[in-house]
Amino acid sequence: EDGGPACYGGFDLYFILDKSGSVLHHWNEIYYFVEQLAHKFISPQLRMSFIVFSTRGTTLMKLTEDREQIRQGLEELQKVLPGGDTYMHEGFERASEQIYYENRQGYRTASVIIALTDGELHEDLFFYSEREANRSRDLGAIVYCVGVKDFNETQLARIADSKDHVFPVNDGFQALQGIIHSILKKSCIEILAAEPSTICAGESFQVVVRGNGFRHARNVDRVLCSFKINDSVTLNEKPFSVEDTYLLCPAPILKEVGMKAALQVSMNDGLSFISSSVIITTTHCSDGS
């Protein structure tokens, strides 16, 4: 791993990669792009999946947080032999399948999809791809697209969440390395700290949640601070203020000393959550302290 910027966010990251015939001589550049990017997501709570598509979609590596499995998944990715059509919708379907089944007892981890393609999608294939990307979104995913060479930016803006979620690489495959930093910056949603991290039992407080990417939501009005109390009850609170690097949130009143609230953030009104290892604990505060 080459140091530099990293992402500490806990979410599910799906790479949906074009392996159609047109990328045959550029697979190495795609592989190195994914490998470099994958190493920059370093939270132990981050899970990753590799999906490739041509005439059909294939899940090369199912969602996993296991770094050894990710290493093996990258090895499998390197061995891919491109060929076939550009059925991007098949890739989205494989992602949606996993997202669907990650819904546990009404709780779903936030999903980020990075889809890479090199060509223009012909009419029907574009329609199918947009439809399947919409479904992934309805299941709680944030969708980014990387377009290389002969892509249609208007199409990709409709498949991705917005024009701002598209990364155009106009200078060919070798230029993929050059967008790693900007993709990391845009796709990373992370919770780094809470201030204060200790609050008085039974009292109302405001918490500043420090992190990055909080304004990457499609609609900032849908951002929520979430407090998972003692690993059981979850309370969602609407932030007073949403900035890219911090949220100002009302903290729930925790009545007893020693209670712990794990901090999570939802970008979509509680449909899915970004997890963190940030904990707020309660303590006894005497009058005047």
Epitope: E93, Y101, R131, D138
Partner: antibody, heavy 121, light 107 residues
Framework: EVQLVETGAEVKKPGASVKVSCKAS????????MHWVRQAPGQGLEWMGW????????NYAQKFQGRVTMTRDTSISTAYMELSGLRSDDTAVYYC??????????????WGQGTLVTVSS | DIQLTQSPSSLSASVGDRVTITCRAS??????LNWYQQKPGKAPKLLIY???SLQSGVSSRFSGSGSGTEFTLTISSLQPEDFATYFC?????????FGQGTRLEIK
């Protein structure tokens, strides 16, 4: 041939629990999610939840949370659905169904033959 | 949760008739809709998946169409074995839900 065979009919008293089993054959048991669906007499179909036979992870419909437990025994390719705190309106046929996976994922096929659970005092 | 409403709830028809059953979703579900046939005392059987794809082994007189919120199941020429109850099912987003069913009887 892919087959799901469920246990025979059960009669239970209100407040009791029932455990229905579903034996799978003709495919790799751990390769496909298993769902449970029930149907009260003369009524429609109601999805109850699923189990991932590989990991044992589950997801239950909100209505059944706290009362239903889905488990599996991979050594005998069998899935189980236990429903506790039975009430008369739990009288239904309980089906185990397999998700065939892509490209037909969540289009249930095949279905078990069903287990009739009657709750009566 | 996404609600599915089938219409009609029941209908009478004769052998050879063309029959259409409608399923309406409370919000758009793309093409994530399946159709099942159920005969008395039997488990449901998958007929159509993804709104219009015919399950293997199912007669081609069954067809499905629609997208978004409105879907139809059509039986082009009713056969005696088609008299049964038909259910639609959405799998667009959890929880999975079913229509209330349409009972098809012999006139």
């Amino acid at each position: 041939e892919v087959q799901l065979v469920e246990t025979g009919a059960e009669v239970k008293k209100p407040g009791a629990s029932v455990k229905v089993s579903c034996k799978a054959s003709g495919y790799t048991f751990t390769g496909y999610y298993m769902h449970w669906v029930r149907q009260a007499p003369g009524q429609g179909l109601e999805w109850m939840g699923w189990i991932n036979p590989t990991s044992g992870s589950t997801n239950y419909a909100q209505k059944f949370q706290g009362r239903v437990t889905m488990t599996r025994d991979t050594s005998i390719s069998t899935a189980y659905m236990e429903l506790s705190g039975l009430r008369s309106d739990d009288t239904a046929v309980y089906y185990c169904v397999r998700d065939p996976g892509s490209p037909k994922w969540l289009a249930f096929d095949p279905w078990g033959q069903g287990t009739l659970v009657t709750v009566s005092s | 949760d996404i609600q599915l409403t089938q219409s009609p709830s029941s209908l009478s028809a004769s052998v050879g008739d063309r029959v259409t059953i409608t399923c309406r979703a409370s919000r758009a579900i793309s093409r994530y809709l399946n159709w099942y046939q159920q005969k008395p005392g039997k488990a449901p059987k998958l007929l159509i998946y993804a709104a219009s794809s015919l399950q293997s082994g199912v007669s081609s007189r069954f067809s499905g169409s629609g997208s978004g919120t409105e879907f139809t199941l059509t039986i082009s020429s009713l056969q005696p074995e088609d008299f049964a109850t038909y259910f639609c099912q959405q799998t667009y987003s959890p929880p999975i839900t079913f229509g209330q069913g349409t009972r098809l009887e012999i006139k």
